[in-house]
Every structure is written in C-alpha cells, then in structure tokens.
Interface confidence: low
C-alpha cells in the first residue's frame, strides 16, 4: 500500500513565500492529487491545488504555482502577506490526498508548530519505481 509524505519549506529570508511538497512512495498509478490546508486562510479546509496527470492543474489563492516535481510528487508554492504568514502558520495543517490505482485515496497531513525548526520537514527518500 502506498505511503504519502508531506514536506513544507519556507525561505528563511522571505516568510511570505513557502512551498508544500508531497508525494507517494512506491509504484503507484496516480489519477488525482489534491493539496489543501486547514487553519491557514479561514476556518475549515481550503483547497489549494488539484493536479491531474493528464488534464493539468488548478490552483487557488494563496497558491501561486502548482506543478509535478516527479511522476509521483507535486509541489505547490504559496505567497501571502508576511504578517499573515507569521500569525497563521503556527495553526496550519497541510494535507495531500493522492488518488491512486488500485489502492484508492491516501491522505497525509503535516501540522506546523512554532517549534518546528525552519518549518521544514525532513526530506524522505524517493524510492519510486516508474517513470
């Protein structure tokens, strides 16, 4: 069964811009990826981007760019006001949902806490089999 990972990276010199990276480990046939967050813009879950491997991507503010990094991982770049970023990131959870064949939907989320050094998760080893 595939395992989904989530990583968040923020530029040390620019707190208003950061990116969410997520992917699935193992050989998977991905039909849809949805990246969302909770507690970032308003209450409830906010859809940031939807990526389809053939039909393209959709993104919504504050997502500025969404793209496939590898055949099994995606990246979403977000931009917002510095003060808003500082105040709300501590309460934010980013979630990535991968719809894969034949396993169905798999979701992973990452909470951001003030104690997270650099608000960045450790980078997982990409052990993907197919191109």
């Amino acid at each position: 069964s595939p395992e989904v990972w989530v990583q968040v990276q923020m530029e040390a010199t620019n707190l208003s811009s950061f990116s969410v990276h997520c992917g699935v480990l193992g050989y998977s046939l991905i039909s849809l990826v949805t990246v969302s967050c909770e507690g970032f813009v308003d209450a409830g879950r906010t859809k940031l981007a939807v990526l389809h491997p053939e039909f393209g991507t959709q993104q919504w503010a504050p997502a500025r760019q969404a793209h496939w990094e590898t055949p099994n991982s995606v990246s979403v770049t977000l931009t917002m006001g510095q003060s808003k970023a500082r105040s709300s990131l501590a309460n934010t959870t980013f979630c990535c949902e991968f719809v894969t064949f034949p396993h169905g939907s798999r979701v992973a989320c990452r909470d951001l806490h003030r104690s997270d050094p650099g608000l960045s998760a450790p980078t997982p080893a990409l052990n993907l089999q197919a191109d």
Partner: antibody, heavy 122, light 106 residues
Framework: EVQLVESGGGLVQPGRSLRLSCTAS????????MSWFRQAPGKGLEWVGF??????????EYTASVKGRFTISRDGSKSIAYLQMNSLKTEDTAVYYC?????????????WGQGTTVTVSS | DIQMTQSPSSLSASVGDRVTITCRAS??????LNWYQQKPGKAPKLLIY???SLQSGVPSRFSGSGSGTDFTLTISSLQPEDFATYYC????????FGGGTKVEIK
C-alpha cells in the same frame, strides 16, 4: 537508434546462479525505469521485475515467484541493467527480455531487447 | 493479483478481415491497459497504451477501446504482417498479461 541488447543467457544447473545484462543505447538511460520479463517455451509473457530511473531512487520491485532470488540493478555509467538470478529452478527456464519502462501516462514498455535464453537443467 | 483473461485463445482469419480480441480484468483497472504484438522468435512490440492510444509508428488499422474491466483490440483490415500473437497487459504491480491470442491464417 534506440536499442536494448540482452546477453548472459545459457545452460545452468538448478541451484546455481546466472547474471543477465541489458545494454542500452540511443537514449538517456538514467531517465528510464527498466523492466525484465520472461517467456517460458510455448507460454505467455511474465513480468519479472523492474528498477526505477536514476531520478526516482533506482529502487526495485519483483514478482512473487522470484522475490529473494533475483536482483535487478543498473550501472548508469555503462547504460546497463542487470538481472542477477540466484538459486535457479527448472521453472525459471525461459527467454528473458529487458524492456524500457514502465513510463508515466502510458505505463507501457515501448522498447524491448531481442531476448536471451536461460535453460535451467541438470 | 489482477488476473487478465483474453479471448479467444486463437483465431483463424483472412487478409482484409476485421479482427476483434477481448481482454477482461478480474477487477477494475481504469484505462491502465496495454496491447502488444509478438511474432515467433521475436520480442513483443507495444501497439496500444492506456487502453486506446496508438503507439507511435503503429498502423492506424490497430485500435483499442474499453475501460474498467473490459477491453478490446481491433484490427480493422488484417494484413499479412499482422499474423502473430497478441497480449494485453495491466499496469498495476505485479504487472500481469493475458494468456495471448494467436491470429492464424485461414
């Protein structure tokens, strides 16, 4: 010309080992996963396993009947994929093919080698 | 594992005939299905990928259709070079093939 050439087949006794090579040319080898298949005499095609491209870690996956006995590896500097076969059984007798892929979107194997014959017999 | 069942296992046809080969998966595989042609003593050749997309360089008389569990390979007008064995293959690991369909000269 995009090409795959297998070598290393032959007659081997049960329990022994054999290493097959698949030499690639005409494309950027590191960008592609590489698969191995086999076909027993008069039978259909069977997937053996594959190894990921350089960018995605080069990890491997195998069919159940060869897991723990067969190992797929690759040498990017030589553009060669290997199939190391240990503890061979008579039922491993087949023509072995290497192929390029599977690829994203298509998941098909679009380039195949000519095959090399492995006979496991005492 | 997903089982692939091809039918018929063999068929006899004449040049110019329309030939249809079917492949059934034991569970839904969406459109993750490929078709290959293999001639005696030769390696397989990819004809159709993703159920219905024609591989580059393959004649347009070959076509594929279907999704879910039922798929079809059609040769609209059989040519002398088309006499071969045809295999379907699904793309979820472990990758599995149908048993093959041998197309022979009537």
């Amino acid at each position: 010309e995009v090409q795959l050439v297998e070598s290393g087949g032959g007659l081997v006794q049960p329990g022994r080992s054999l290493r097959l090579s698949c030499t690639a040319s005409g494309f950027t080898f590191g960008d592609y996963a590489m698969s191995w298949f086999r076909q027993a005499p008069g039978k259909g095609l069977e997937w053996v396993g594959f190894i990921g491209s350089k960018a995605y870690g080069g990890t491997t996956e195998y069919t159940a009947s060869v897991k723990g006995r067969f190992t797929i590896s690759r040498d990017g500097s030589k553009s060669i994929a290997y199939l190391q076969m240990n503890s061979l059984k008579t039922e491993d007798t087949a023509v072995y093919y290497c192929a390029r892929g599977p690829r994203r979107y298509t998941y098909g194997m679009d380039v195949w080698g000519q095959g090399t014959t492995v006979t496991v017999s005492s | 594992d997903i089982q692939m069942t091809q039918s018929p296992s063999s068929l006899s046809a004449s040049v110019g005939d329309r030939v249809t080969i079917t492949c059934r998966a034991s569970q839904s595989i969406s459109s993750y299905l490929n078709w290959y042609q293999q001639k005696p003593g030769k390696a397989p050749k990819l004809l159709i990928y993703a159920a219905s997309s024609l591989q580059s360089g393959v004649p347009s008389r070959f076509s594929g259709s279907g999704s879910g569990t039922d798929f079809t390979l059609t040769i609209s007008s059989l040519q002398p070079e088309d006499f071969a064995t045809y295999y379907c293959q699904q793309s979820s690991t472990p990758l599995t093939f149908g048993g093959g369909t041998k197309v022979e000269i009537k």
